[in-house]
């Protein structure tokens, strides 16, 4: 019974001491996206590189078919950056034509899918109106936060327009998660 | 069978239980930049405050000559924010003069230097076109992600134009890393 | 001398081994803000949801009256995203009227309050000029970094204009912290 003095006895049960180096972790990097079917009103999911270059998955965190699979329940820090790039936005064209200024937008959503729950859960959203004056524009949206996930949960990154995603370099567009 | 020692069963070896408080960590904050020589086509590196105010380095994570030195191999979360500020961008001036709209841009790169590899590795990049209408503009670029680093690796933050960096406050422009 | 096998003997003293699952953690999400008195020249603080939806506090990290209370000294990763939205900015109106282009701005500050110190400390600031051409604009500001906090410290998120904060969805505007 020695050692119980350091903490409530229940803690050994749900959160035993463990080596940090064996925690599930992943950093995924952008690759060229192949256009895929997606439902109207549903943002398409990005697919990712998971072992070449800076990308890796380790300690039972697996990547398959656009999803990061959570192998163990716990609190995870999840992050993503998507760099968008485009030509003059529609807003700019509309403005020049003297019509109402409805801005375009770019959006990134990190989504959780739980088999036992019918609807995906949006964990994080970054959304920005784009009403650029220059002929070419580019900009990143960064997201990151901590969430309690369950074993078997799946994470994906959805974007408003897959054709605007900058896939040219692994340091510009990425997605990761690690167990705290 | 040489080399097998590095695979799965190894985890107790390279990642024993250890106190979280003794992990390498640093948070560096902005200082006024002194203009320095840098190669054409190579972004200049920022230098940082490492012990005054909010800044600190601890547990063998050292800062020297614009670099954070990684004292121990492992997975690190690395982050930086750079706040840029400027006068009306060239893009805006060009637009008024009726010339083509080539936008200016601002870029932050977190770079890794490994002595055993000739080329620096770009870990993270945030890049944004700047085509502002107002006479003065300012905006941050934030980056953060997890990377597997080796003992002896060096990290730095490079920017596209050092003269646009807002060095007025330690909370606006910063750079940090911690072992997970 | 039992236990020395796990780590250098000094570690037991200042940072005992502890289960990751019992570390103070919180993720707070946006709710509709009620207009409150705040001093001129002082940004108003946001209040937050702390237990419904994605929001949670755990392991003695408590939320009360706009503040996250730090229950234990150590190094914390602190983050927030605030999504702003507005109509055509004043800058745009000013420009059309031919007056000088003083841009509007949006600002987020993560502030630390320490009872033993009279002034709040600004830990993180994200500030951006807003000079949009479109009639409606929206955009996030994200912040995140590591800080050494003391037991009893209080954290809050302040914004330049509470009426511009998008409180419609818990994934758009949030605030969190966790002990490393």
């Amino acid at each position: 019974l020695k050692g119980q003095e350091f903490a409530p006895s229940h803690q050994q049960v749900y959160a035993p001491l463990r080596a940090d180096g064996d925690k599930p972790r992943a950093h995924l990097t952008v690759v060229r996206q192949t256009p895929t079917q997606h439902f109207k009103n549903q943002f398409p999911a990005l697919h990712w590189e998971h072992e070449l270059g800076l990308a890796f998955t380790k300690n039972r965190m697996n990547y398959t078919n656009k999803f990061l699979l959570i192998p163990e329940s716990g609190d995870y820090f999840i992050y993503s950056q998507v760099t968008f790039r485009g030509m003059t936005s529609e807003c700019s064209e509309i403005r020049q034509a003297g019509r109402p200024n409805k801005p375009d937008s770019i959006t990134v959503v990190i989504t959780k899918v739980t088999d036992s729950y019918p609807e995906p859960t949006q964990l994080l959203m970054g959304t920005k109106s784009v009403c650029e004056v220059g002929s070419n524009w580019f900009q990143p949206i960064y997201l990151g936060a901590m969430f309690s996930l369950q074993e078997g949960d799946k994470l994906m990154v959805n974007v408003s327009d897959i054709s605007l995603v900058d896939y040219t370099k692994e340091d510009k567009t990425f997605f990761g998660a690690f167990l705290l | 069978l040489k080399g097998q020692e590095f695979a799965p069963s190894h985890q107790q070896v390279y990642a024993p239980l250890r106190a979280d408080g003794d992990k390498p960590r640093a948070h560096l904050t902005v200082v006024r930049q002194t203009p320095t020589q840098h190669f054409k086509n190579q972004f200049p590196a920022l230098h940082w405050e490492h012990e005054l105010g909010l800044a600190f380095t601890k547990n063998r994570m050292n800062y020297t000559n614009k670099f954070l030195l990684i004292p121990e191999s492992g997975d690190y979360f690395i982050y930086s924010q750079v706040t840029f500020r400027g006068m009306t961008s060239e893009c805006s001036e060009i637009r008024q003069a009726g010339r083509p709209n080539k936008p200016d841009s601002i870029t932050v790169v977190i770079t890794k230097v490994t002595d055993s590899y000739p080329e620096p590795t770009q870990l993270l990049m945030g890049t944004k076109s700047v085509c502002e209408v107002g006479s003065n503009w300012f905006q941050p670029i934030y980056l953060g992600a997890m990377f597997s680093l080796q003992e002896g690796d060096k990290l730095m933050v490079n920017v596209s134009d050092i003269s646009l960096v807002d060095y007025t406050k330690e909370d606006k422009t910063f750079f940090g890393a911690f072992l997970l | 001398l039992k236990g020395q096998e796990f780590a250098p003997s000094h570690q037991q003293v200042y940072a005992p081994l502890r289960a990751d699952g019992d570390k103070p953690r919180a993720h707070l999400t946006v709710v509709r803000q009620t207009p409150t008195q705040h001093f001129k020249n002082q940004f108003p603080a946001l209040h937050w949801e702390h237990e419904l939806g994605l929001a949670f506090t755990k392991n003695r990290m408590n939320y009360t009256n706009k503040f996250l209370l730090i229950p234990e000294s150590g190094d914390y990763f602190i983050y927030s995203q605030v999504t702003f939205r507005g109509m055509t900015s004043e800058c745009s109106e000013i420009r059309q009227a031919g007056r000088p282009n003083k841009p509007d701005s949006i600002t987020v500050v993560i502030t630390k309050v320490t009872d033993s110190y009279p002034e709040p400390t600004q830990l993180l600031m994200g500030t951006k000029s807003v000079c949009e051409v479109g009639s409606n604009w929206f955009q996030p500001i994200y912040l995140g970094a590591m800080f050494s906090l003391q037991e009893g410290d209080k954290l809050m998120v302040n914004v330049s204009d509470i009426s511009l904060v998008d409180y419609t969805k818990e994934d758009k505007t949030f605030f969190g912290a966790f002990l490393l």
Partner: antibody
């Protein structure tokens, strides 16, 4: 000494299949990206496919996508290229080449090449 | 049509200096990806000549050098020798193709 030895080439009719092999020696095979590169008679080099060290990531040139499959057996230090629905324009010498480690994939060249195996697609 | 553009042929007399250019785009060389050069002697497999824009593998004479700027790269050979007569290929990574790309090759003739 590092060596790559290709085999499996030959004459095949259009629409047919062939499986190329490349046996590696002299280096830690599983630590390196491997690739297939081909050279049509009198023409230049054309990259065909690449595979990561563990085999989990694969990429293909558009000209062979959906018809060719790259794979590896790290226990046998062997790289494979399964070629289906072959066409006359697939006629070439096929080289197996060693790339860099997974980490430097985007930035490394091919530092070791096999001697090549000839594939002829003709009726 | 190759993704990277090289001149089909160059020539020079023994002892002279020749350069071979390699022009790419914003999805390969211009994106910051390294350029590598290969030498293919008649009837043999290609051999790595320059890696990472300007580095020579051991055994490659210092008469061979590489450089890169913007969306293009070049290979320089000084003190030309008859045994340098070969085909030379540049190669890089191309993000829009998710793979490696080669130039069309340049035949070097030593006069």
């Amino acid at each position: 000494e590092i060596q790559l030895l290709e085999s499996g080439g030959g004459l095949v009719q259009p629409g047919g299949s062939l499986r190329l092999s490349c046996v590696a020696s002299g280096f830690t095979f599983s630590s390196y990206v491997m690739s297939w590169v081909r050279q049509a008679p009198g023409k230049g080099l054309e990259w065909v496919s690449v595979i990561s060290g563990s085999g989990g990531s694969t990429y293909y040139a558009d000209s062979v996508k959906g018809r060719f499959t790259i794979s590896r057996d790290n226990s046998k230090t062997t790289l494979y290229l399964q070629m289906n629905s072959l066409r006359a324009e697939d006629t070439a010498v096929y080289y197996c080449a060693k790339g860099g480690t997974n980490y430097y994939y985007y930035y490394s060249g091919m530092d070791v090449w096999g001697q090549g195996t000839t594939v002829t697609v003709s009726s | 049509q190759s993704v990277l553009t090289q001149p089909p042929s160059v020539s020079g007399a023994p002892g002279q200096r020749v350069t071979i250019s390699c022009t790419g785009s914003s999805s390969n060389i211009g994106a910051g990806y390294n350029v590598h050069w290969y030498q293919q002697l008649p009837g043999t497999a290609p051999k790595l000549l320059i890696y990472g824009n300007n580095n020579r593998p051991s055994g490659v004479p210092d008469r061979f050098s590489g450089s890169k700027s913007g969306t293009s790269a070049s290979l320089a050979i000084t003190g030309l020798q008859t045994e340098d007569e070969a085909d030379y290929y540049c190669q890089s990574y191309d993000s829009s193709l998710s793979g490696w790309v080669f130039g069309g090759g340049t035949k070097l003739t030593v006069l």
